[in-house]
């Protein structure tokens, strides 16, 4: 009831958790104009990974998409290619999950096909909500190394005279959003990858016991019963659970121009 | 047809009150923004202020803060311009004008007269 | 506060005449976020309310006459009128619309010889 119960409970968390990832990468709002400290413009600036926006005061909003591929920073691609690789593995882990939950009965699956399929779906949203986090992460540590350039030369006058004041841009709404679906996908995997262990079916070692019948000896080894799961034995499944703890990925940033409008 | 009509003009004692009014029609009122703008005789154009009747977010120049206070009413499509404490200062045209994309004031009101004299 | 500086105060020209009139900001009016100067000049004649003529320092309202062309970035601004008509004497101004509040310039007046 209890495996169950996490391995539902695991499912329902990657959902959210995927859902939030998809919602933030399609986000507009990843970085948006800082306005403390600034003066108050009638302007609202807000950049996402596909396009930038203006609001006006008017309440006209305007939306550029970056129409080019090679003119963009590669920092901004590594963002994008870790939400879709996020994404992408998140929905195949969703997709296997379905099919492992307890609750679902699909043919004459076996519990040992189940506790495969909830590990491999459990790594999967680990994964993925791995790459939520660091592509939310890269495109922070770019923002801040940008907000403290642009800082430093804010106002670039001549003669003494303001000409220009650089919009500044600070955390937009979609990194929080990303932040929190990624963590609840990575919740939502290790839960699952809990549940599994709890799936496994484990083989009971008893010790060999000599029964003596009179004239002959025979010796009854009791246990074989649940040799036909095709699970392997305990050592094996400890095997499984060490390689699924291996999935970690280590994402370096470096700073990198953010303005790509 | 898209017009802003404002109230007749106005003959105020200094300290009094006056609130003047600015009717929109030909559009949805609240769909967009209602700036207000100073005009003493001869002089140029100041702007003072403006109501987002979508929200009841109001934006005041600095030296409109304090006696100067904007409202509307949406049902009656009107936007109100009330000035407490008059001073002969305050002589002078008060336009409203709509906002529009680009933060441009694409339609004016005709503008009311306000006289304030002891 | 922005400043917006309007030169000349006032200028006489002929009927037929080629005019232009500068507007200059303290700040830069353009937004980096969709590369638009927020600059609006207006219309205002005599005994009537201000009339919209240019948005976005250079896109024309509807109904404006192709006359009256809008130019320039970042802090400096011309309005010119390829061919002054008698129904063009107005004061002419110029007004911030990026930053708040939305100042406008001390106006250009045209007056027609």
């Known amino acids: 009831m209890a495996v169950t119960a996490c391995q539902g409970l695991g499912f329902v968390v990657s959902l959210i958790g995927i859902a939030g990832i998809i919602a933030a990468t399609c986000m507009d709002q990843w970085s948006t104009q800082d306005l403390y400290n600034n003066p108050v413009t009638a302007v609202f600036n807000y950049q996402g990974l596909w396009r930038s926006c203006v609001r006006e005061s008017s309440g006209f909003t305007e939306c550029r998409g970056y129409f080019t591929l090679l003119g963009l920073p590669a920092m901004l691609q590594a963002v994008r290619a870790l939400m879709i690789v996020g994404i992408v593995l998140g929905a195949i882990g969703l997709l296997v999950s379905i099919f492992a939950l307890k609750c679902i009965r699909i043919g004459s699956m076996e519990d040992s096909a189940k506790a495969n399929m909830t590990l491999t779906s459990g790594i999967m949203f680990i994964v993925s909500g791995l790459c939520a986090i660091a592509g939310v992460s890269v495109f922070a540590n770019m923002l801040v190394t940008n907000f403290w350039m642009s800082t430093a030369n804010m106002y670039t006058g001549m003669g003494g005279m303001v000409q220009t004041v650089q919009t500044r841009y600070t955390f937009g709404a979609a990194l929080f959003v990303g932040w929190v679906a990624g963590g609840l996908t990575l919740i939502g995997g290790v839960m699952m990858c809990i549940a599994c262990r709890g799936l496994a079916p484990e083989e009971t070692n008893y010790k060999a016991v000599s029964y003596h019948a009179s004239g002959h000896s025979v010796a009854y080894k009791p246990g074989g019963f649940k040799a036909s799961t095709g699970f392997g034995s305990n050592t094996k499944n400890k095997k499984i659970y060490d390689g699924g703890a291996r999935t970690e990925d280590e994402v370096q940033s470096y700073p990198s121009k953010h303005d790509y409008v | 047809e898209i017009q802003l009509v404002q109230s007749g003009p106005e003959l105020k004692k200094p300290g009094e009150t006056v609130k003047i009014s600015c009717k929109a029609s030909g559009y949805t009122f609240t769909n967009y923004g209602i700036n207000w703008v100073k005009q003493a005789p001869g002089k140029g154009l100041k702007w003072m202020g403006w109501?987002?009747?979508?929200?009841?977010?109001?934006t005041y120049a600095e030296e409109f803060k304090g006696r100067f206070a904007l409202s509307w009413k949406t049902s009656a499509s009107t936007a109100y311009l009330q000035i407490n404490n008059l001073k002969n200062e305050d002589t002078a045209t008060y336009f409203c004008?709509?906002?529009?994309?680009?933060?441009?004031?694409?339609?004016w009101g005709q503008g009311t007269t306000l006289t304030v004299s002891s | 506060d922005i400043v917006m500086t309007q030169s000349p105060s006032s200028l006489t020209v002929t009927a037929g005449e080629k005019v232009t009139m500068s507007c200059k900001s303290s700040q830069s009016l353009l937004n980096s976020g969709n590369q638009r100067n927020y600059l609006t000049w207006y219309q205002q004649k005599p005994g009537q309310p201000p009339k919209l003529l240019i948005y976005w320092a250079s896109t024309r309202e509807s109904g404006v006459p192709d006359r009256f062309t809008g130019s320039g970035s970042g802090t400096d601004f011309t309005l010119t009128i390829s061919s002054v008509q008698a129904e063009d004497l107005a004061v002419y101004y110029c007004q911030n619309a990026y930053y708040y509040p939305l100042t406008f310039g001390a106006g250009t007046k045209l007056e027609i010889k």
């Open positions: 109501i987002n009747p979508n929200t009841g977010e109001t």
């Open positions: 004008a709509r906002l529009y994309y680009g933060n441009r004031f694409d339609y």
